[in-house]
């Protein structure tokens, strides 16, 4: 499978909510012993590899935000920890995987990465990630709502092993 990022750039006003999205593409094994680990983290545009550095999102680590579920299941972070920080990650039946961030501040600006890992009965088999930029703006130049910029087809299909 691959991970696509439908949008490479999100530009949002302060105080708005935003949902960043990744999408699984290609055949997904739904065998009973196959599960998926999905998470989000912040990073920086590394010279060698995007998403190689991992930083927390609003003080929550990639492990705090992770989902782990079977290939045929939907899931979301129901734990209080994420919600207390205005965060919720979710995954649906159609391969969409998202994180919603509420009440954005300028400090939320940066590079965000999604990570998807296919696990086949205890063994981490396949790791892929996607990256997107969030710009939070304030003042008269800020948009009234979030504006999203589609990835080029090349970018959205681009996969790097994590």
């Amino acid at each position: 499978f691959k991970v696509a990022t439908p949008y490479s750039l999100y530009v949002c006003p302060e105080g708005q909510n935003v949902t960043l999205t990744c999408r699984l593409l290609g055949p997904v094994d739904k065998g009973h012993d196959v599960t998926f680990y999905k998470t989000w983290y912040r990073s920086s545009r590394g010279e060698v590899q995007t998403c190689s550095e991992r930083r927390p999102i609003r003080n929550l680590t990639f492990q705090d935000l992770h989902l782990h579920h079977g290939g045929h299941q939907a899931a979301n972070t129901s734990h209080d920890l994420a919600q207390r920080h205005g965060l919720e990650s979710a995954s649906d039946h159609h391969g969409n995987f998202s994180i919603t961030m509420r009440n954005l501040t300028l400090l939320d600006s940066g590079l965000y990465c999604c990570l998807v890992v296919e696990i086949r009965h205890h063994h981490s088999e396949h790791r892929v990630h996607g990256a997107m930029e969030l710009q939070v703006q304030t003042g008269k130049d800020a948009p009234s709502n979030c504006v999203v910029y589609p990835s080029s087809s090349q970018d959205s299909e681009n996969i790097t092993a994590a």
Partner: antibody, heavy 121, light 106 residues
Framework: QVQLQQSGAELMKPGASVKISCKAT????????IEWVKQRPGHGLEWIGE????????NYNEKFKGKATFTADTSSNTAYMQLSSLTSEDSAVYYC??????????????WGQGTLVTVSA | QIVLSQSPAILSASPGEKVTMTCRAS?????MHWYQQRPGSSPKPWIY???NLASGVPARFSGSGSGTSYSLTISRVEAEDAATYYC?????????FGGGTKLEIK
């Protein structure tokens, strides 16, 4: 906070059976494999097998088939291992451990405190 | 089954020394996990996927390796590191542990 609480030490006669319990708290018990591990002095750690509480699926180390039987009760978040036809070779500390998927890598993330089983005539 | 052989069985070091222990697999693996067990305690997850430290593990620990050869290194040993360290593979059933390396502090 994830915790695995195991039942207390057992002194058993050869030929008898013993059932060890492992009560899990702090996570969704049904979704993660419970592993069972044997440790004899000077013998290191030996994987016995595992059970997925939600489905009841089990996998055994061939060496322990017929010796160990796993069950789980999702209503009480408790896993059990029964050891049958005990011999002195079964004298050991038995651990339950819960699978944790950390950074996309499953491993033995949480361990019980161990249950000492002594087999003696 | 995949056999994991750890060496040395016993390692003796003075505080501040650098120590390395190895784990060799009978078949090639894509990664290795390590656990620490102090006397009288349950094992603790220590290093995952060859080189990543579990939460709370001091930065003086590191792991490396690939294929059939893996190692755990402590850059400057401290008294609290006295324990037995086990490698473990989860690639094929039966899932196996190494025999352990017991680290003694002089």
């Amino acid at each position: 906070q994830v915790q695995l609480q195991q039942s207390g030490a057992e002194l058993m006669k050869p030929g008898a059976s013993v059932k060890i319990s492992c009560k899990a708290t702090g996570y969704t018990f049904s979704r993660y494999w419970i592993e069972w591990v044997k440790q004899r002095p000077g013998h290191g750690l030996e994987w016995i097998g595992e059970i997925l509480p939600g489905s009841g699926s089990t996998n055994y180390n061939e060496k322990f088939k017929g010796k160990a039987t796993f069950t789980a009760d999702t209503s009480s978040n408790t896993a059990y291992m029964q050891l049958s036809s005990l011999t002195s070779e079964d004298s050991a500390v038995y651990y339950c451990a819960s699978e944790e998927v950390y950074d996309g890598y499953p491993w033995f993330g949480y361990w019980g405190q161990g249950t000492l089983v002594t087999v003696s005539a | 089954q995949i056999v994991l052989s750890q060496s040395p069985a016993i390692l003796s070091a003075s505080p501040g020394e650098k120590v390395t222990m190895t784990c060799r697999a009978s078949s090639s693996l894509s990664y290795m996990h390590w656990y620490q067990q102090r006397p009288g305690s349950s094992p603790k997850p220590w290093i995952y996927a060859t080189s990543n430290l579990a939460s709370g593990v001091p930065a003086r620990f590191s792991g490396s390796g690939s294929g059939t050869s893996y190692s755990l290194t402590i850059s400057r040993v401290e008294a609290e590191d006295a324990a037995t360290y086990y490698c473990q593979q989860w690639s094929s059933n039966p899932y196996t542990f190494g025999g352990g390396t017991k680290l003694e502090i002089k």
